[in-house]
Interface confidence: medium
Amino acid sequence: YDFTNCDFEKIKAAYLSTISKDLITYMSGTKSTEFNNTVSCSNRPHCLTEIQSLTFNPTAGCASLAKEMFAMKTKAALAIWCPGYSETQINATQAMKKRRKRKVTTNKCLEQVSQLQGLWRRFNRPLLKQQ
């Protein structure tokens, strides 16, 4: 999906007002220095691409974040403010047929959400030069 035509300011507002708090809640009890940020993004569409991938695609060691509150809110914000996003998601979901594992907050999931926090912070500061 091409995130170029999303309403970035509305998505930023959604992040600042609610998604950021849910990410912090998920990471509660974890030191902010515990994980190194290894995923980066260069502009807002690229950041949303990476955010979508890390939030909704199952990875080794972290089967599914899809029903976490920050993920549900992320999906809602993208669905509302990115034209045509839902149709793309329907096709992707049917192609993946992913299975949800027992809900366990693994260290791998914590690392993944830490990466998400970095991507969202980067999304909110699009004019900063890439580190």
Partner: antibody, heavy 123, light 106 residues
Framework: QVQLVESGGGVVQPGRSLRLSCAAS????????MHWVRQAPGKGLEWVAV????????YYGDSVKGRFTISRDNSKNTLYLQMNSLRGEDTAVYYC????????????????WGQGTTVTVSS | SYELTQPASVSVSPGQIASITCSGD??????ICWYQQKPGQSPVRVIY???KRPSGIPERFSGSNSGNTATLTISGTQAMDEADYYC?????????FGGGTKLTVL
């Protein structure tokens, strides 16, 4: 109290158009996503469309895509459904329903429903 | 398109437990709502986010959702619970309803 009142239903010939209205009161209309849901005689609920906030996306059920248009006028606290190229299978009671207030309750369903307005498509 | 499947009818004796199922591919990945509709009336939401009960809905209504099946459970079913029940989920940004289950209290 929170209330939704639909109007605009009636008998219409196939191929013609009709516009339904839903007047909202008792809550901040502009802050909520709004849905249309229909129910054919003796059948189950069928989702028709949703319109979120000002400037946001609209989504439609497959059976009405390209024929129906959902819109809203926040200054009038009113939701609309413009129905074009009507068919016999569009005959139903049409309900207006309130959806999400924010991103957190996006998936919480529809908590307030109107009483419905009946649309009959017949020659 | 995504489909939710419900039994057409369920019968239960007063005071017994009624279980109404709703099945769909990987349904546990989605949040489910349940609606009650009595004849001639508009639907009423009785469960949201799988298992949460709106204010004003009796405690005898509960919900669960895992794997491919969501279940609405009514413990101590009363005559007033006789109605049609619909499950509902989001498939991305489109709403999907189950076909509905007629609950008969014998």
């Amino acid at each position: 109290q929170v209330q939704l009142v639909e109007s605009g239903g009636g008998v219409v010939q196939p191929g013609r158009s009709l516009r339904l209205s839903c007047a909202a009161s008792g809550f901040t209309f502009s802050s909520y996503g709004m849905h249309w849901v229909r129910q054919a005689p003796g059948k189950g609920l069928e989702w028709v469309a949703v319109k979120w906030y000002e400037g946001s996306n609209k989504y439609y059920g497959d059976s009405v895509k390209g024929r129906f248009t959902i819109s809203r006028d926040n200054s009038k606290n009113t939701l609309y459904l413009q129905m074009n190229s009507l068919r016999g299978e569009d005959t139903a009671v049409y309900y207006c329903a309130r959806g999400a207030h924010d991103y957190g309750d996006f998936y919480y369903g529809m908590d307030v429903w109107g009483q419905g307005t009946t649309v009959t498509v017949s020659s | 398109s995504y489909e939710l499947t419900q039994p057409a009818s369920v019968s239960v004796s007063p005071g017994q437990i009624a279980s109404i199922t709703c099945s769909g591919d990987n349904l546990g990945d989605k949040y489910i709502c349940w609606y009650q509709q009595k004849p001639g009336q508009s639907p009423v939401r009785v469960i949201y986010q799988d298992n949460k009960r709106p204010s004003g809905i009796p405690e005898r209504f509960s919900g669960s959702n895992s794997g491919n099946t969501a279940t609405l459970t009514i413990s101590g079913t009363q005559a007033m619970d006789e109605a049609d029940y619909y499950c509902q989920a989001w498939d991305s940004s489109t709403v999907v309803f189950g076909g509905g289950t007629k609950l008969t209290v014998l």
